[in-house]
């Protein structure tokens, strides 16, 4: 009995369907095909669990939080043991394996190992302004998102018909700010983060107001 | 009570420059954080912006029209202006000033009556 | 053409509940939820609801927003004479870079 080789990984975004692959080779009818597929989940690795398992030309639950949501790809008994995990979570991700055994054929390789990572487009952002207003102040305009995987990468820009920030203005993408040192009038203004990763965007706006000093009344 | 009033020319001449005038009362337009916008509403259709100005002069356009827009502010006499050049009949609308801000997460909460602008020779 | 989709009309019998529908993309709608305008004929627009549910003081409380992915919804309960408008949908478009609108959907009100 062999396993093939998997493709090594699978993404998907979450809620959406995702499609392990595992098939293998026997020299032995199906008669006696024992399947299980299990996952280390990567948020909790001592504690691997049962995703499904075919035993006995019946199909059986694993673990409670796949009930509903897993089932094999074909109709079983089948050399292609591949399964579908539905609406899939964060938590699904991990490294999944199949092990298959198809008495009396024994010997050779009987598990196949694919990882999964369930990807999350950016939630909506929190655009914020740390430090004071006041002309010639420094201000931290701040841009995150509470969730991302992978972790969103953060563009800011000023909406003005240039598209760009204030020439005292020093951003980073990767955590999401921008420093303006200095600021002025021409600071002042609609500026837009739009976070970013792999399978989607979000954004929010933020309007920046440059306090000018009181003239004072002699 | 904020109000807005739009005034100019009803009546433009295809290839010219449409020059229309927004007057703010009641609200300061120095008063920051609030972006003044012009929308215009083709016959019987739908609303299109045009594009917004902040009291410190700083513009941003539509994408779509930038090459022809201008937006000025007067801040003594709380007004912002529109220009738009090369117009054609595809022009002719209903145009409104109108207010955006933080509080209305940058929707328009307060808009003029609108002025009609035909191109036409 | 309009950035946001909406049906051109729709009929109501007095004191029904209406439900307008606005269909954007992720970048807009689906990002950033939606406003609500209603037009008298001759008259501005007024600002109805903005970011899904939130409301300017003096709205009517018959009035409710809500959002489904890309898709915007404006629920009219106890339908009124008054209530016989133009219903514009607005959101931010965060990859064109500009408010977009909805064509608009004339709310009949029999």
């Known amino acids: 009995l062999e396993v093939s080789e998997s493709p090594g990984s699978v993404q998907v975004a979450r809620g959406q369907t995702a499609v392990l692959p595992c098939a293998f080779s026997t020299s032995a009818a199906l008669l006696n095909l024992n399947v299980i597929w299990m996952v280390i989940p990567l948020s909790n690795a001592n504690q691997p669990e049962q995703v499904i398992l075919y035993q006995g030309g019946q199909m059986f639950d694993g673990a409670l939080r796949f009930h509903g949501r897993v089932g094999f790809t074909g109709t079983m008994p089948a050399t292609n043991v591949s399964i579908f995990i539905n609406n899939t979570q964060l938590s699904d991700t991990g490294t999944y394996q199949c092990l298959v055994n198809n008495l009396p054929d024994r010997g050779g390789r009987n598990i196949g190992v694919t990882g999964l990572t369930v990807l999350v487009p950016p939630s909506a952002p929190q655009c914020q302004i740390q430090g004071s207003q006041d002309l010639g102040s420094d201000v931290i305009l701040l841009c995150s998102s509470e969730e991302g995987i992978p972790r969103p990468t953060y563009l800011w820009e000023k909406l003005d018909n240039t598209l760009k920030l204030p020439p005292t203005a020093t951003q980073d993408q990767v955590q999401g700010t921008v420093t303006i040192r200095n600021i002025s009038a021409l600071s002042s203004g609609l500026y837009q983060c739009v976070a970013s990763n792999a399978i989607g965007t979000s954004t929010c706006l933020l309007d920046l107001q440059v306090i000018s000093p009181q003239p004072r009344s002699v | 009570e904020v109000q807005l009033l739009e005034s100019g020319p009803g009546l433009v001449k295809p290839s010219q420059t449409l020059s229309l005038t927004c007057t703010v009362s009641g609200g300061s337009i120095s008063s920051g954080g609030y972006y003044w916008s012009w929308i215009r509403q083709h016959p019987g259709k739908g609303l299109e912006w045009i594009g917004y100005i902040y009291y410190s002069g700083s513009t941003y356009y539509n994408p779509s029209l930038k090459s022809r827009v201008t937006i000025s502010v007067d801040t003594s006499k709380n007004q912002f202006s529109l220009k738009l050049s090369s117009v054609t009949a595809a022009d002719t609308a209903v145009y409104y000033c109108?207010?955006?801000?933080?509080?209305?997460?940058?929707?328009?909460?307060?808009w003029g009556q609108g002025t009609l602008v035909t191109v036409s020779s | 053409q309009p950035g946001l989709t909406q049906p051109p009309s729709m009929s109501y019998g007095l004191g029904q509940t209406a439900t307008l529908t606005c269909t954007g993309n992720?970048?807009?709608?689906?990002?950033?939820?939606a406003a609500w305008l209603q037009q008298h004929q001759g008259h501005p627009p007024k600002l109805l609801s903005y970011?899904?549910?939130n409301g300017p003081s003096g709205i009517s409380e018959r009035l409710s927003a809500s959002r489904s992915g890309n898709t915007a919804s404006l629920t009219i309960s106890g339908l009124q004479p008054e209530d016989e408008a133009d219903y514009y949908c607005?959101?931010?478009?965060?990859?064109?870079?500009?408010?977009?609108f909805g064509g608009g959907t004339k709310l009949t009100v029999l």
């Open positions: 109108a207010r955006a801000s933080r509080s209305t997460d940058y929707y328009f909460d307060y």
């Open positions: 992720r970048n807009n709608i689906g990002d950033q939820g």
């Open positions: 970011r899904n549910n």
């Open positions: 607005s959101a931010w478009d965060s990859s064109l870079r500009a408010w977009v």
